[in-house]
Interface confidence: low
């Protein structure tokens, strides 16, 4: 039987001769050279050679355990004479023995990590890891210990885990943001003679809100014209905050001051400035200076830093309102005046008033916008604003006159204002009533007395306060001996009645009745209108059958035959 089972061989042999591995030996070997030893398997004949007579095995090259830790070979012992095996072929192994020939290597050449500024001591930052290719099961060649070479006193590393932690209280990003830490990993449990590797860890402190906003000055002053409309920006203020990102965001507000309701402050999200804007219309003549207290505060606060003080700051903002040359202001937005239509030229109707609202109180002159009074019916006293007529009026032609009056600063003609002026022309009884239409009627030859043949209506261009009251009568020259009568209905109408039984169209075919219409106003106005009555032949139902047409060409006027 074979007298071996496995061999051990030290890796990385540096001797000049081949490295002796061991000896294959069969108890059938009598030492007379009758047996031949044969080696096959991993590296046989190349890496490993055997003396076929003695069975001595040697390694021809340096072996590296980290490359191949175990070699499996087969041994044979053959009788040289017969060529037959004297032992069954058997497998054996060569184990490569480890030496500490590999240093620890970190998984990254450079690590990057962040940790909040002001973090508590012992706050986890990052874990680094190094691996050692040597045999972890034998000795301490692969036992790695971590230590910090650079980065104290700010950071520490746990020797066994490679966990880096903060080691200093109150590390302030605003003071220093970047740290470079060098970590060493050493094998042999860190003992002398151990191999080592290093890595760099770049650590950045991230921002926390540990700084309040601060105004660089305690007082700001701005100017704005009184005419600035609401929303007009008049100045910018900026508080600085040493933090970054949302921790440096600032909200501005007006917390106090006499102009609290006159101004607003809005935050410009891009620049983190506070923009002071006009909230309500300003008036230099009412108030010329405003003082505000503006506060800048952080909207995102970390409660654990409240002990550092309030995260806000205040400044005083003084706003000076500049006078602007404003146009004159009328005492009313519109004026309504009245004048009788019989007013003489140069009659004063009323007046308008405007004044310069500026502190200077510049004098004002008045004029009529001629585009609104093309016929130059009205005029205005340029000094006192009195409106007077320059032509005669007629209510029946135009009831309302809508004109525009301009007030202009004498010292600055560009500063002008306009106001509408509505002038109502009041009625005077200067028109007589007239027939509402041309009246032409007929009467049957066989008509009976007191028969109504026509109802009369009248119109009057005037517009009396108590309404129209017309009276109707035959003209005096036609009243006596007339063939017809006028009946006044007292409701602004009248009827024409027959006065006799029967008319003869051959004797008188047409009657012209002069009717006087009067109104009941002062002074009384009257006119005479003519009604044409034609005599016609009628059937027994009273339907007209034939009439003479001469009346159609008769001039309107009086007829002695009425």
């Amino acid at each position: 039987s074979w007298m071996w089972n496995q061999f051990f061989l030290l890796e990385e042999y540096t001797g000049s001769d081949y490295q002796y591995v061991g000896k294959l030996h069969s108890d059938q070997d009598r030492g007379d050279g009758s047996l031949k030893y044969i080696l096959s398997g991993d590296g046989a004949g190349d890496l490993f050679i055997i003396n076929e007579n003695t069975g001595d095995i040697q390694a021809t090259k340096r072996l590296d355990r980290e490359e191949k830790p175990v070699y499996i070979l087969r041994a044979q012992a053959i009788n040289r004479r017969t060529g037959r095996p004297v032992e069954p072929e058997s497998e054996f192994i060569i184990k490569i023995h480890d030496i500490n020939d590999n240093e620890p290597i970190f998984t990254k050449d450079v690590y990057t990590a962040t940790v909040p500024e002001m973090a508590d001591v012992g706050t986890f930052v990052v874990q680094v890891t190094a691996t050692d290719a040597d045999d972890p099961t034998y000795g301490n060649s692969a036992k790695v210990v971590y230590s910090i070479l650079q980065g104290q006193p700010y950071f520490s590393v746990e020797s066994e885990t490679g966990i880096i932690k903060t080691a200093l209280l109150n590390m302030d990003r605003e003071n220093r943001e970047q740290y470079q830490v060098v970590i060493q990993a050493k094998d042999m449990g860190g003992q002398m003679g151990g191999l080592s590797g290093t890595t760099t860890v770049n650590i950045t402190l991230t921002d926390v809100n540990d700084n309040p906003p601060r105004f660089p000055q305690s007082t700001y002053q701005f100017k704005t014209p009184e005419s600035s409309p609401p929303g007009t920006p008049i100045g910018r203020i900026k508080a600085s905050d040493a933090d970054v990102g949302e921790n440096a965001e600032i909200e501005y507000s007006i917390t106090d001051g006499e102009g609290h309701d006159m101004f607003d402050v809005i935050t410009d999200q891009e620049t983190q400035e506070g923009i002071i804007t006009v909230k309500k219309l300003l008036d230099f003549e009412k108030k010329r200076v405003y003082t505000l207290k503006v506060e800048a505060s952080n909207p995102h606060i970390e409660p654990r830093f409240l002990y550092l003080g309030p995260f806000k700051d205040s400044a005083t903002v003084r706003i000076v309102v500049d006078d602007v040359d404003e146009p004159p202001v009328f005492s009313k937005p519109a004026y309504i005046l009245q004048i009788r239509e019989d007013a003489q030229i140069n009659t004063t109707i009323g007046s308008v008033a405007a004044q310069d609202p500026d502190a200077a109180r510049n004098p004002v002159k008045y004029s009529v916008d001629r585009h609104t009074d093309m016929d130059r019916i009205f005029n205005i006293d340029s000094g006192n604003g009195s409106i007077f007529t320059s032509k005669l009026l007629d209510r029946e032609t135009l009831l309302w006159h809508n004109i525009t009056v301009i007030a202009t600063e004498i010292n600055n003609p560009k500063q002008s204002s306009r106001v509408p002026l509505y002038i109502k022309v009041l009625d005077v009884n200067d028109n007589a009533p007239e027939f509402a239409e041309f009246y032409e009627t007929f009467v049957c030859e066989k008509a009976k007395a007191d028969q109504l043949i026509q109802t009369l209506h009248a119109v009057d261009k005037d517009d009396p306060y108590s309404g129209h009251q017309f009276s109707f009568s035959l003209a005096p020259e036609a009243a006596s001996g007339s063939n017809f009568t006028i009946q006044d209905n007292k409701d602004n109408t009248a009827g024409i009645l027959t006065r006799k039984n029967g008319y003869n169209r051959h004797e008188m075919s047409t009657y012209l009745l002069p009717v006087v219409i009067s109104d009941n106003d002062y002074p009384v106005q009257s006119s005479t209108g003519t009604v044409t009555v034609r005599v016609c032949a009628c059937d027994h139902h009273g339907n007209m059958q034939s009439c003479h047409a001469e009346a159609l060409i008769h001039p309107t006027g009086l007829s002695t035959g009425a």
Epitope: P225, S227, S228, P229, P230, G231, T232, T277, V324, D325, E326, P327, H371, P413, K414, Q415, S416, S417
Partner: antibody, heavy 127, light 107 residues
């Protein structure tokens, strides 16, 4: 910064309608009066109309050639000015600009200048 | 209505003074504004209220209003000032532009 951007232009047949928009940014839109001004190809500037701010009544005025056909409106919640054009004629072909009235430059009523203009949008009326 | 009349064109050598007029019978009563327009661009306000200059407009631009004429003056004219110039005024709520003047900078 103040920006005015017109949109909605294009080709339309005579008698047709078109609605232009003008999107504003960079200023307090609701405090300002705004104009529409047009420019026919190779010609000068022609005023179309104006709309005042709501605080000043929000009233509109129009040039005689467009009165009754064009309507100006504004949506202060969207910072947008509109021009509704109806019964379009070939002579309405032009680049249409919106312009802001500057209330901080001048204090004389109607007489404000136009301090910011958009780049314009082309309206072509053709059959 | 107000009417504003401008010369169609004005030529000037670089460095010289250019004057563009705007005439109308209502000019003494109403303020005049001036706009510059370069090809393919929107108008830019260069003078307002007869003689005031907006911020960002060079000092060489000035304006005046006398009698029935408003004048835009560009002293020390530069090549970049070549553009169309429009006067504008407002009367009775109606905005009116002049017909425009093409300023050519020679050379």
């Amino acid at each position: 910064q103040v920006q005015l951007v017109e949109s909605g232009g294009g080709l339309v047949k005579p008698g047709g309608s078109l609605r232009l928009s003008c999107a504003a940014s960079g200023f307090t839109f609701n405090s300002y009066a705004l104009h529409w001004v047009r420019q026919a190809p190779g010609k000068g500037l022609e005023w179309v109309g104006r709309i005042k701010s709501k605080t000043n009544g929000g009233t509109t005025d129009y040039a005689a050639p467009v009165k009754g056909r064009f309507t100006i409106s504004r949506d202060d919640s969207k910072n947008t000015l509109y021009l509704q054009m109806n019964s379009l004629k070939t002579e309405d072909t032009a680049v249409y600009y919106c312009a802001r009235v500057d209330a901080t430059y001048s204090y004389s009523g109607y007489y404000y200048p136009m301090d910011y203009w958009g780049q314009g949008t082309l309206v072509t009326v053709s059959s | 209505d107000i009417e504003l009349t401008q010369p169609p064109s004005v030529s000037v050598s670089p460095g010289q003074t250019a004057s563009i007029t705007c005439s109308g019978d209502k000019i003494p009563t109403y303020t005049v504004h001036w706009y510059q327009q370069k090809p393919g661009q929107a108008p830019v306000l260069v003078i307002y209220d007869d003689n005031k200059r907006p911020s960002g407009i060079p000092e060489r631009f000035s304006g005046s209003n006398s009698g029935n004429t408003a004048t835009l003056t560009i002293s020390g004219t530069q090549a970049e000032d070549e553009a169309d110039y429009y006067c504008q005024s407002t009367a009775s709520g109606t905005v009116v532009f002049g017909g425009g003047t093409k300023l050519t900078v020679l050379g």
